[in-house]
Each structure stands twice: as C-alpha cells, then as structure tokens.
C-alpha cells in the first residue's frame, strides 16, 4: 500500500502544530523528564515489515488522538491549535486506515502486528500513567508534548524510507 504524498504533508503539519502548542520552556521542566521507552524497533526494519510499521503507526496516531482528546488535555492547550491538531490526526487516520484494511486477513502480517500494536499500546500506557502520577501538571504535559513530537518525527522519517523502497 502506498501512502499518498498528502499524508507526509499532514504529518509535518501535525508536527508544526505540536511545536506551536508549547506554552512553557522545555528547560524549566528538566526535572520532570522521563524515558517513556519509545518502541523504535517496531518502526525499524525492511520492506517485509512495512505493513507492521503502518499498522503500528495507525495505533500510535489513534492513541495520540485519544490522549489529546481528554478533558485534562483540553485544559492544557490552546483550543484553536488543539482543534487543528485533531483535524490533522483524523486525516492521517483515514489515510492509514485504507492501508491497514488492505492487509487485514493476511495471517503472517496479523501475527507480526500483535506484538507491534501491543508495544505501542504499552508506550502510551506509560505516558498515561506518567501524566496521572504528575497530576497533569503543565510541565508533565510539556514533557509529553515533546515526547510525541519525537515519536512523530521518527515515524515521519520511517514513512519517507518506506516510500523510497517502493
């Protein structure tokens, strides 16, 4: 499955919006830094693992959407930027949905995807528990925003690589 060029542009727009959403200096939150253990191995790999990576990226965007859709998130960010961010994520989910649907029913891909989907889910569980532990403080949200930016950047580069291999 080939992702449309617009998908990559949407990804970049989402990254720009995430950057714009920053309200406080990252340096003032250094004490709150945390290693969430981004499951990079899920997104690495060869062409055979392309379906796995796309499926995992869909899960990542879906979990990001859910994370930023909570009432705690709404209180933390600028409403206009947040709404624009939702739109970009929604569009990306639509693009990826078509790709993942094509692979549904392929047995070896399904087995591979179990672990990759669970790895992404666990990553977001760590983020969720971190935010709760920090009582959704402004610095906690800033750390999470920066983390999501890093993971999006990584997967954007991955998708460029996948397109080149095609």
């Amino acid at each position: 499955c080939d992702l449309p060029q617009t998908h990559s542009l949407g990804n970049r727009r989402a990254l720009i919006l995430l950057a714009q959403m920053g309200r406080i200096s990252h340096f003032s939150c250094l004490k709150d830094r945390y290693d969430f253990g981004f499951p990079q191995e899920v997104f690495d790999g060869n062409q055979f693992q392309k379906a796995q990576a796309i499926s995992a990226f869909h899960e990542m965007i879906q979990q990001t959407f859910n994370l930023f859709s909570t009432k705690d998130s709404s209180a933390a960010w600028d409403e206009t930027l947040l709404d624009k961010f939702y739109i970009e994520l929604f569009q990306q989910l639509n693009d990826l949905e078509a790709c993942v649907t094509q692979e549904v029913g392929v047995e070896e891909i399904a087995l591979m995807n179990e672990d990759s989907i669970l790895a992404v889910r666990k990553y977001f569980q760590r983020i969720t528990l971190y935010l709760m532990g920090k009582k959704y403080s402004p610095c906690a949200w800033e750390v999470v925003r920066a983390e999501i930016m890093r993971s999006f950047s990584f997967s954007t580069n991955l998708q460029k690589g996948l397109r080149r291999k095609d």
């Epitope: 499926s55 869909h58 879906q62 979990q63 959407f65 859910n66 994370l67 859709s69 989910l93 990826l96 949905e97 993942v100 649907t101 549904v104 399904a110 995807n113 179990e114 672990d115 989907i117 669970l118 889910r121 666990k122 977001f124 569980q125 760590r126 969720t128 528990l129 709760m132």
Partner: antibody
Framework: QVQLQQPGAELVKPGASVKLSCKAS????????MHWVKQRPGQGLEWIGE????????IYNENFKSKATLTVDKSSITAFMQLSSLTSEDSAVYFC????????????WGQGTLVTVSA | QIVLTQSPAIMSASPGEKVTLTCSAG???????LYWYQQKPGSSPKLWIY???NLASGVPARFSGSGSGTSYSLTISSMEAEDAASYFC?????????FGSGTKLEIK
C-alpha cells in the same frame, strides 16, 4: 456517557451459529478497540479477542480462533461476534468491553448476552 | 499464555476484618498491566484497581493493591457488607490477555 448495549439472551441449537451484537454510544467508536470476553456460569473470565473498528484488524486468543469471528459495522456503530458450530461448552455470558489506557482499560462493559445452547 | 492463579477460591470475612486476596502469575507480569475487577451476581465486571495499585473512580479508600513480578494482591483494610463480590485479576502484559479464576468474597 459511554454505553455498550447488548441483547439479554440468545437460545440456539447445537451445531448452529449465532451473531451477537454490541452497540456503542457516547464516544468515537472508531477510536477504541472493542474486546469480547466469555464467562461460563459460576466461572472465571476468558478473553476471546479484540477488533479495531477503524480498519477491522482483529487479534484473537488462539483458543477461540476457530470459534469466534469479530466484525464491526461503522454505520451503525456496532461490534459483532459470530460464534459457530455451537456446543454446550459455548453456553455462557458474552461481554463486550471497550479498550483504552490507564483507568480506561476495560472500564466500560456491556451488560452481557447469555447464550444458551440447547436442543 | 500467562496463567493467573487466585487464592483462595472462596472466602468469608466478618465486617471490620482485614482481607487479602492474592493473584499469582505463571510468568512475570509488568505491574503497569495488572488490573483487578469486581463483579456482583447478574452484573458485568467493574474496573476496581488498575496498574497494580491505583484505585478506579468511586472505589472506597479501604481497598488497596500491591505486588510485582509474579505476585500480586488486593487488600481490604476493613471489610464491609457491600464488598461481598467476586474479584478477578487480569493481565494485558502479553497476548492472549488473561484473567484469574476469581475469588468469591462473602460476608459472615
């Protein structure tokens, strides 16, 4: 508020199939995986599998792969589970439960459908 | 698959008594993915404790959870009549997700 509606009961004959439904409301249906869980009378809970309503990807417990088929209908925001070649061992209450994270994992359950397999 | 063994299968406690239910995993489970559910007859399970030690919304403070690796527990500091129910531990650390066989807690 989040709600998952399931019919109360289904009576089916041995060897037949049954399709159970779980109608969602109060949240964006396509954003959360839907899980199915089996409970035999007076017994524990068994995880059957899950489906992502967004793209239809399914993940099954190997023990139920030849028994259950999970599907969704996005237009009616409903998840389905078809159980085939029914025997008395399949008589149980079947719950749907919504995925999530942290305090949202399996925080929402349907009331359950009692399936009775009897001639 | 990870087998979760709960003990005892049935127990009864007097009001005010301290109660501890245990859940033993066949292989190690990350504490972030160990949950407890309460179920009363004729009802669906309710999320009770998530990630080993966090109480779900509305759960009384007399409940607590602890553990790591293969050994987990749910404790009630002072039993009350409304606590009579079945309690199931659950893991989603690895596929297939599994539940314990449950402990039925009765009031004396």
């Amino acid at each position: 508020q989040v709600q998952l509606q399931q019919p109360g009961a289904e009576l089916v004959k041995p060897g037949a199939s049954v399709k159970l439904s779980c109608k969602a409301s109060g949240y964006t249906f396509t954003n959360y995986w839907m899980h199915w869980v089996k409970q035999r009378p007076g017994q524990g809970l068994e995880w059957i599998g899950e489906i992502n309503p967004s793209h239809g990807r399914t993940i099954y417990n190997e023990n139920f792969k030849s028994k259950a088929t999970l599907t969704v209908d996005k237009s009616s925001i409903t998840a389905f589970m078809q159980l085939s070649s029914l025997t008395s061992e399949d008589s149980a209450v079947y719950f749907c439960a919504r995925g999530g994270l942290g305090p949202a994992w399996f925080a929402y359950w349907g009331q359950g459908t009692l399936v009775t397999v009897s001639a | 698959q990870i087998v979760l063994t709960q003990s005892p299968a049935i127990m009864s406690a007097s009001p005010g008594e301290k109660v501890t239910l245990t859940c033993s995993a066949g292989s190690s489970v990350d504490s972030s993915y160990l949950y407890w559910y309460q179920q009363k007859p004729g009802s669906s399970p309710k999320l009770w404790i998530y990630s080993t030690s966090n109480l779900a919304s509305g759960v009384p403070a007399r409940f607590s959870g602890s553990g790591s690796g293969t050994s987990y527990s749910l404790t009630i500091s002072s039993m009350e009549a409304e606590d009579a129910a079945s309690y199931f531990c659950h893991q989603w650390s690895s596929y297939p997700f599994t539940f314990g066989s449950g402990t039925k807690l009765e009031i004396k």
